[in-house]
Interface confidence: low
């Protein structure tokens, strides 16, 4: 096979968080982040190679304690395919409850053209520290 | 490509437990742990092949309840490159808050000679149970 | 190498939860789940190719809040080899404490014929939502 498509993204909050959608970025200005194959479109990741992918994410809430987290509950993170609309689905969902970090991963088939979106619902802001909040994919097999 | 370099390590508290650095070990005496390519140096993992790696970790605190965890907050786990000094960086960081286990993973480029260190700051002890605390890397692509 | 063996499973609660063993399923009726190589036997995953595997899991408790989780503590999730008996071992263990989701992953050697079992001890029920509870393996190397 050719080199597997991979990406590791950092949070790129260039505008006030008016909507729950997290916008991601990659490149030297954003720590050790990169895209090898997939592309970023308006802060979302677009897949360019069909196959089975390992999708992983970690999100840490900024200025957070277990008290903050429980007070502002529910704070939920969801990763899904948001376009094309015909393939829209939630792939991964976690709530923060009394914690300030969620981290998970899953294997899922993705198709060329699928765009992945990550939504953080609730009132708390995500941390932009490069070792606390990141999102990535790794192509595993056709 | 040659077989990908991989390692899965268990906690090996053979040195004073007085500094925050966790020391790891591998081999038959330590459960299902091994190193295939990377090497252990004084309990830290040294990379021997350039490339993109999936780094994963789970750490469980010993003799812990949510009350203990919140009382002893902040307890934080960080994984980073600690040498060479010129490449020193924190790759992954999580706090325990009211939980007794953290687990996460990320894709990150590593170079031959990079040494990975894991620091558990705070006052609680990590569990040495082989199914509760482990740390590993998997080479993914050049 | 041939295509790596992989599986991503969804919870398949077709019988009342009388015992702590979670039963898994795959296929179109259960979201984006599949088996490529490993096989399901009575809701457990049977390995058909020797090698090193990345095992990952996420389990979310149904109708759960941090209060529920702490009230019903201990609720613990364990993944292990349950047969053949000679290879029986716990590979991965996490407690929920005050959270409603656990997620983790680890590298572990598995052999053809190994059957993986997942046990959820405690009184709370797991969520069957396909984006909240899943279990998978990915062959990494021989």
């Amino acid at each position: 096979h050719p080199e597997p498509h991979t990406a590791e993204l950092q949070l790129n909050l260039t505008v006030p968080r008016k909507d729950p959608t997290l916008r991601w970025g990659a490149g030297p200005a954003l720590g050790r982040s990169f895209t090898h194959g997939p592309e970023l479109e308006e802060g979302h990741l677009r897949i360019h190679q069909d196959g089975l992918y390992m999708v992983h994410i970690q999100v840490t809430l900024a200025i957070c304690s277990s008290t903050t987290a429980s007070r502002h509950h529910p704070t939920t993170l969801a990763v899904g395919i948001c376009s094309p609309a015909s393939r829209s689905i939630s792939l991964l969902r976690l709530s923060f409850h009394q914690g300030c970090t969620i981290a998970s991963q899953r294997l899922t088939p993705l198709a060329r053209g699928d765009t992945l979106c990550t939504n953080l619902t609730g009132t708390l802001l995500p941390s932009r520290n490069t070792d606390e909040t990141f999102f990535g994919v790794q192509w595993v097999r056709p | 490509h040659p077989e990908p370099h991989t390692a899965e390590l268990q906690l090996n508290l053979t040195v004073p437990r007085k500094d925050p650095t966790l020391r790891w070990g591998a081999g038959p005496a330590l459960g299902r742990s091994f190193t295939h390519g990377p090497e252990l140096e004084e309990g830290h993992l040294r990379i021997h092949q350039d490339g993109l790696y999936m780094v994963h970790i789970q750490v469980t605190l010993a003799i812990c309840s949510s009350t203990t965890a919140s009382r002893h907050h902040p307890t934080t786990l960080a994984v980073g490159i600690c040498s060479p000094a010129s490449r020193s960086i924190s790759l992954l960081r999580l706090s325990f808050h009211q939980g007794c286990t953290i687990a996460s993973q990320r894709l990150t480029p590593l170079a031959r000679g990079d040494t990975l260190c894991t620091n558990l700051t705070g006052t609680l002890l990590p569990s040495r149970n082989t199914d509760e605390t482990f740390f590993g890397v998997q080479w993914v692509r050049p | 190498h041939p295509e790596p063996h992989t599986a991503e499973l969804q919870l398949n609660l077709t019988v009342p939860r009388k015992d702590p063993t979670l039963r898994w399923g795959a296929g179109p009726a259960l979201g984006r789940s599949f088996t490529h190589g490993p096989e399901l036997e009575e809701g457990h995953l049977r390995i058909h190719q020797d090698g090193l595997y990345m095992v990952h899991i996420q389990v979310t408790l149904a109708i759960c809040s941090s209060t529920t989780a702490s009230r019903h503590h201990p609720t613990t999730l364990a993944v292990g080899i349950c047969s053949p008996a000679s290879r029986s071992i716990s590979l991965l263990r996490l407690s929920f404490h005050q959270g409603c989701t656990i997620a983790s992953q680890r590298l572990t050697p598995l052999a053809r014929g190994d059957t993986l079992c997942t046990n959820l001890t405690g009184t709370l029920l797991p969520s069957r939502n396909t984006d909240e509870t899943f279990f998978g393996v990915q062959w990494v190397r021989p």
Epitope: - | T14, P16, K18, D19, P20, A62, T123, L124, L125, P126 | -
Partner: antibody
């Protein structure tokens, strides 16, 4: 209820040996670090030694290093202190103490036995 | 001579407040010394009160509190009671791998 019961103390001549035992009950002995702490008559406390939960790692105070050996038998829920080359200044009540596990840096003793008296005198 | 210093004795009236301190012969005590406090009544084993500067052990009444005051660790008892009469030992982490205990403070509750 956590219980620690020491035994094996007594009168011994300088240069002699004694073996102290501590029987533990009421908790999962095999997950706790264990310690010996001593208290000379009318004096303060002195940490002597500790051993990790699996028995593979031991530490000693400088005053007893090379003379005392701490060990444990998790199958018997027992802690031991082998004391050789005893000196007059080793005279003390010896306590078996459980490390709470609250600290990755320093032993914190949350349960103690009632102690056993060791007298080193000619 | 002791590295960890404590007042040899202190007196308090019932219902009163008293502060016991724990210092270093040379240098200041900080939270990095993980100050721990134990109570010992005559003929009994010590009992853990406070650890990691200010965390009360389970079952310890909230009239006992720990802190850093200036360059010393402190144990404060508010609303002293007759059964608080005991010897109090502090312990500090100074160097690997041990803890160093102070000489103890004999607290008398007058009344």
């Amino acid at each position: 209820e956590v219980q620690l019961v020491e035994s094996g103390g007594g009168l011994v001549q300088p240069g002699g040996s004694l073996r102290l035992s501590c029987a533990a009950s009421g908790f999962t002995f095999s997950v706790y670090y264990m310690n010996w702490v001593r208290q000379a008559p009318g004096k303060g406390l002195e940490w002597v030694s500790d051993i990790n939960n699996e028995g593979g790692t031991t530490y000693y105070a400088d005053s007893v290093k090379g003379r005392f050996t701490i060990s444990r038998d998790n199958s018997k829920n027992s802690l031991y202190l082998q004391m050789n080359s005893l000196r007059a200044e080793d005279t003390a009540v010896y306590y078996c103490a459980r490390d709470a596990g609250y600290s990755n840096h320093v032993p914190i003793f949350d349960s103690w036995g009632q102690g056993t008296l060791v007298t080193v005198s000619s | 001579q002791a590295v960890v210093t404590q007042e040899p004795s202190l007196t308090v009236s019932p219902g009163g407040t008293v502060t016991l301190t724990c210092g270093l012969k040379s240098g200041s005590v900080t939270s990095d010394n993980f100050p721990t406090w134990y109570q010992q009544t005559p003929g009994q084993a010590p009992r853990l009160l406070i650890y990691n500067t200010n965390t009360r052990h389970s079952g310890v009444p909230d009239r006992f509190s720990g802190s850093i005051l200036g360059n010393k660790a402190a144990l404060t008892i508010t609303g002293a009671q007759a059964d608080d009469e005991a010897e109090y030992f502090c312990a500090l982490f100074i160097s690997n791998p041990s803890v160093e205990f102070g000489g103890g403070t004999q607290l008398t509750v007058l009344g």
